[in-house]
């Protein structure tokens, strides 16, 4: 049974539905939980071959991670498997969907089911209602980031199969007592929440009970607001390169960014034998924009091919948002083509605005 | 969202200078170049020149030269341009534009202009 | 400063396409991938439909599209509508901004 128009549960495992194409959906897992994201084809019609991305890198299908054109699954997630994941096709590369996961410990935030609680005879003759998983109870205050998914979960038992309930702050919770709505799964013992806002914090108390009993448990909501910052560059990246006259190199950017990061390669030059303008503001050439409107990993990365001795130098890579910028810098050197490739071994340096 | 708010109208005499202003909100002021266009009646997109909020350094279009100042005011978000000398011809609606690109950076190749002010009009008449 | 050179005018009908050509010169619009598009309607400020040549801000309809060859940019609008009817302007920045001296498009 469920609440509205919620019809995702499929199979053991409910799915979390593709944000629409160009938004990110924010997604909280519990540790243990199984991750299911689904990513139907825009419009309804014919997708194509696809490919599940996370954090960059192709997924590779195991016993724990399943892979399907339109749905991935991750059994038993644990916290590496938080981070980005996106559907593309795999001719164009175009992102269909895009998800930021977080797996954090129990009792678990997120429109995901493992399917492990579904009420069942439990083959008692009779009895008072009892926790089946209380191990996965034992967090009582979950603080989540505004925007995230939240699901309270009070897996029960007993004979008669035992009815849920739930009040928030003492009071019976429904639907219509917030914007969004809230989705009860009463095989899964569980209410979701989506996209939570600062007036969903709370007590969340979930009562169940049969004719011989009644058991109750309650949550702490705490709703984080999110304090933006600027993008945050992954440490090392960009790193300094040594390479041979004519040969290609890529340096790479790892940003991180609530709001739609902006990112521009630069290249340091000098002009009528300065490398800083009047202020000491060091002079730049923008050698590659990556716009809004895009999340292509490609952006990512600069690639120069068939370098020449003027490639050497410093190159930035400069992401931007609303807030600020935040920069990181690395180093190009050329060898002649006779001299053997050496491994630059000093870090980037690093800039921050 | 980013919001770039400037004076109102003005009605100059030739001779006199104008200070228009531009309050930017939105965004963290001192990350981006504002630069300063205008537009004279009728006429095209002409180029004064740019202040980097951080450092307060200054490029200002050949034909400005001596009579633009550019300023800013870091603690209101606020950039300044003030013409001086006015004649009829300097009639036209000022625009404040941020400049895509860092103010940590001085871009000699590259970048855009992203957004706007809603412009204001400077009026020399005798 | 020398401006870019663009038509003073086109003009299309609805469902057609049109292109607005931009030429400057090899240390300009030739040497580097710089020039930007800009939609102005009368009495309103300019606003940014293409950067970088052919990239296009989140927010602006797929049916402006942007490139270049040579020394010439060109906006390309297809499926034109009434509401693309207004001015525009190209762009390139190299230690100043230059414009191109705008070009008013009708629909008809």
């Known amino acids: 049974e469920s609440l509205g128009t919620e019809q995702r549960v499929v199979g053991r495992a409910a799915e979390v539905p593709g944000p629409e194409p160009g938004q990110q959906e924010q997604l909280v897992f519990g540790s243990g939980d199984a991750v299911e994201l689904s990513c139907p084809p825009p419009g309804g019609g014919p997708m194509g071959p696809t490919v599940w991305v996370k954090d960059g890198t192709g997924l590779v299908p195991s016993e724990r991670v399943l892979v399907g054109p339109q749905r991935l699954q991750v059994l038993n997630a644990s916290h590496e498997d938080s981070g980005a994941y996106s559907c593309r096709q795999r001719l164009t590369q175009r992102v269909l969907c895009h998800f930021s996961v977080r797996v954090t410990d129990a009792p678990s935030s997120g429109d995901d089911e493992d399917g492990e609680d579904e009420a069942e005879d439990t083959g008692v003759d009779t009895g008072a209602p009892y926790w089946t998983r209380p191990e996965r109870m034992d967090k009582k205050l979950l603080a989540v980031p505004a925007a995230n998914t939240v699901r309270f979960r009070c897996p029960a038992a007993g004979n008669p199969t035992p009815s849920i309930s739930w009040l928030k702050n003492g009071r019976e919770f429904r639907g219509e007592h917030r914007i969004g709505g809230i989705k009860l799964r009463h095989q899964q013992w569980s209410l979701v929440m989506e996209s939570v806002v600062p007036s969903d914090r709370g007590n969340y108390t979930c009562v169940v009970e049969n004719k011989f009993g009644s058991i109750r448990q309650t949550y702490t909501l705490d709703v984080l607001e999110r304090s933006p910052h600027r993008p945050i560059l992954q440490a090392g990246l960009p790193a300094n390169q040594t390479a041979v006259l004519g040969s290609d190199v890529e340096f790479h950017c790892k940003v991180y960014s609530d709001a739609q990061p902006h990112i521009q390669w630069l290249k340091h030059v000098e002009v009528n034998g300065s490398k800083v303008g009047p202020d000491g503001t060091p002079y730049v050439t923008v050698l590659k924009t990556a716009g809004a409107n895009t999340t292509d990993k490609e952006l990512e990365v600069l690639s120069l091919h068939n370098v020449t001795f003027e490639d050497a130098g410093e190159y930035t890579c400069l992401a931007g948002n609303s807030i600020g910028f935040s920069h990181h810098s690395a180093w190009l050197v050329v060898l002649p083509a006779e001299e053997e490739l050496v491994e630059a071994d000093e870090a980037g340096s690093v800039y921050a605005g | 969202q980013v919001q770039l708010v400037q004076s109102g109208a003005e009605v100059k005499k030739p001779g006199a200078s104008v200070k228009v202003s531009c309050k930017a909100s939105?965004?963290?002021?001192?990350?981006?170049?504002m630069h300063w266009v205008r537009q004279a009646p009728g006429q095209g997109l002409e180029w004064m020149g740019w202040?980097?909020?951080?450092?307060?350094?200054?490029n200002y279009a050949q034909k400005f030269q001596g009579r633009v100042t550019m300023t800013r005011d870091t603690s209101i978000s606020t950039a300044y341009m003030e013409l001086s000398s006015l004649r009829s011809e300097d009639t036209a609606v000022y625009y404040c534009?941020?400049?895509?690109?860092?103010?940590?950076?001085?871009?000699?190749?590259?970048?855009?202009?992203?957004?706007w002010g809603q412009g204001t009009l400077v009026t020399v008449s005798s | 400063d020398i401006a870019l050179t663009q038509p003073a005018s086109v003009s299309g009908s609805p469902g057609q396409s049109i292109t607005i050509s931009c030429t400057g010169t090899?240390?300009?619009?030739?040497?580097?991938?710089?020039v930007s598009w800009y939609q102005q309607h009368p009495g309103k400020a300019p606003k940014l439909m293409i950067y970088d040549v052919s990239n296009r801000p989140s927010g602006v309809s797929n049916r402006f599209s942007g490139s270049k060859s040579g020394n010439t940019a060109s906006l390309t609008i297809s499926g034109l509508q009434a509401e693309d009817e207004a001015d525009y302007y190209c762009q390139s920045h190299h230690f100043y901004e230059v414009f191109g001296g705008g070009t008013k498009l009708t629909v008809l």
């Open positions: 939105g965004y963290t002021f001192t990350s981006y170049y």
């Open positions: 090899s240390s300009d619009v030739g040497g580097y991938n710089y």
């Open positions: 534009a941020r400049y895509y690109g860092s103010s940590l950076y001085h871009y000699v190749f590259g970048g855009f202009i992203d957004y």
């Open positions: 202040i980097n909020p951080n450092s307060g350094g200054t």
